[in-house]
C-alpha cells in the first residue's frame, strides 16, 4: 500500500473506498470490521479476494477461503415468499414454504425435533444499535446474518440463561483518538456517563439444517467471522456492524 493518503486514513474507524484493498489491509481494517486479512487462513494459489465475481472458482471453495463467497452453489435461489418468511421467521411455527436454505430454514422452526449441531466457538459482533432495539429486531438481525452465512444463528445465553447482548459504549483506543479525535464534543470529565451507542452480541452457529442441505457449512466461527468481514468489504451488510471476532473457547459470561 504505497499511498500516503491511505496511511493517514487507516484505522480511523471509517471505511475509505480508495484504501479498501488487500494491499492496504482493507483500510487498516476500517472496511472489514477491524479484521485486516479475512483471507489469512486461505491457502489457495488464487488470490481469492479477487475472485468475488459471481462465478464459481473451486480453488476458493473452502471454509478458509470463505466458500468463494458461496458462488459455487448449484441451486442458488432467492426466497420466493421473502416478506412472509421474514415475518414468520423463528416464530416457533413451522412454515414449510419457508423451510429452505434461501429462506433461512424458517429459523429452524421446522427442525425443533432435530438435535442442534453447533459450530465450534462464538461470534462476537459489535453493532451500532442499542440492546433494546437489537433485541426487538433480533429475528430480522439473525435472519440477515444467517442469509449471508448460509446457516442459522442464535444469541448465546450465559450461565444464568440470560441472552448475551450487552450495551456498547465505544472504544477509547489510540486508533479512535487519531488526529485528536473524540467521539463527542464534551470535555473529558463529562464523559464518565457515556451513552450507549450500540450492542455487543454473542452468537452461536447452529448447522443442524445446513449439514443436511449443503457441504458448505462452517465448522467453527473463525471463517464465519471472516465471511462477515468480506461482506463488509463489499458493502453488502444490511446492519451497522462495527467489528466481528471469533472466540473458539469463550467464557459464558464475558462482557
Amino acid at each position: 500500500c504505497q499511498s500516503q493518503y491511505c496511511a493517514d486514513k487507516a484505522r480511523d474507524g471509517i471505511c475509505d473506498e480508495a484504501c479498501n484493498s488487500h494491499a492496504c489491509q482493507w483500510d487498516g481494517g476500517d472496511c472489514s470490521l477491524t479484521m485486516e486479512d479475512p483471507w489469512a487462513n486461505c491457502t489457495s494459489t488464487l488470490r481469492c479476494w479477487e475472485y468475488i465475481n459471481n462465478q464459481c472458482d473451486e480453488q476458493c471453495n473452502t471454509a478458509e477461503c470463505l466458500f468463494d463467497n458461496f458462488e459455487c452453489q448449484r441451486n442458488s435461489k432467492t426466497c420466493k415468499y421473502d416478506k412472509y418468511c421474514a415475518d414468520h421467521f423463528k416464530d416457533n411455527h413451522c412454515d414449510q414454504g419457508c423451510n429452505s436454505e434461501e429462506c433461512g430454514w424458517d429459523g429452524l422452526d421446522c427442525a425443533s425435533d432435530q438435535p442442534e449441531n453447533l459450530a465450534e466457538g462464538t461470534l462476537i459482533i459489535v453493532v451500532l444499535l442499542p440492546p433494546e432495539q437489537l433485541l426487538q429486531d433480533s429475528r430480522s438481525f439473525l435472519r440477515a446474518l444467517g442469509t449471508l452465512l448460509h446457516t442459522n444463528l442464535r444469541i448465546k445465553q450465559d450461565s444464568q440463561g440470560a441472552l448475551m447482548v450487552y450495551p456498547y459504549f465505544g472504544e477509547k483506543s489510540a486508533a479512535m483518538k487519531k488526529q485528536k479525535m473524540t467521539r463527542r464534543s464534551l470535555p473529558e470529565e463529562q464523559e464518565q456517563e457515556q451513552e450507549v451507542i450500540g450492542s455487543k452480541i454473542f452468537l452461536e452457529i447452529d448447522n443442524r439444517q445446513c449439514v443436511q442441505d449443503s457441504d458448505q457449512c462452517f465448522k467453527n466461527t473463525d471463517a464465519a467471522a471472516a465471511l462477515l468481514a468480506s461482506h463488509a468489504i463489499q458493502g453488502t451488510l444490511s446492519y451497522p456492524l462495527v467489528s466481528v471476532f471469533s472466540e473458539l473457547e469463550s467464557p459464558r459470561n464475558a462482557q
Epitope: Y5, D12, G13, I14, C15, D16, E17, A18, N20, D30, C31, L128, L129, Q133, G170, E171, M176, K178, Q179, M181, T182, R183, R184, I197, G198, A232, G235, L237, Y239, P240, L241, V242
Partner: antibody
Amino acid sequence: EVQLVESGGGLVQPGGSLRLSCAASGYTFSSYGMSWVRQAPGKGLEWVSYIYPYSGATYYADSVKGRFTISADTSKNTAYLQMNSLRAEDTAVYYCARHSGYYRISSAMDVWGQGTLVTVSS
Amino acid sequence: DIQMTQSPSSLSASVGDRVTITCRASQSVRSFLAWYQQKPGKAPKLLIYRASIRASGVPSRFSGSGSGTDFTLTISSLQPEDFATYYCQQYYISPWTFGQGTKVEIK
C-alpha cells in the same frame, strides 16, 4: 422520517466566529457519516467537512483546514461546525448532509438539511 | 484533488425531450459517483448513486451510466418538475468534489 435541521447561521464580521448545529432525527445518529457542504450565492456546491460520529473520524477541505472544526454529540444527535477566522469567501448557505453508507465514507449524501445562511461582511 | 467537469453548463429543452448531461473526472473514481438535483432556494436532492443506482423515490426516467472517468445522466422524457440544476459528485477520494453544475431551462 429522517430529518436534518441546521441552525446557527447569521451575519459575522471577518475574523469572527460562528458555530453551526445540525440536529438529526429519525435514524441511529452514530451509524452514519455527516458532511457539511456549502454553496456561495449563485455558485455551485463545495464539500467542507465530514465526521463519522461513532469513531469521531474527521476530514476537511483544504480551504477550511485549521479554521473550521467539525464535531458530534451522540447524546444529542447533533453535529456541529465551529467556524473561526471567518473570511468574506466563507459567505454561503451551509447544508448538513447524511452519508448513506453505515461506516463507509465513500457513500453519497442521501438526506440534506434545509441550509443555514452565513454572511461574512464588515 | 479530483476535478469534476460537467457539460454543458446549461441547456434549453422542452417537456418530453431526452436530455443528456455528461461528467468527466480528472482521474478514475471507479463507480463512486452521485448525481444531485437542486431547485432554486432548495437543498440538493440525491438522484443517482454508485453511478447508476436510482435513489429511493426517484422516477425511472432518470438514469445514470459510466465508470472510471466518464459518466452520463439521462432524463428520458423531461417533465416540468425536472427544470433545475444538476450536479455530479465523486466520493471516491477526499476531498469530495462536485461538478460546476448544469442548468436545465425551459426552451
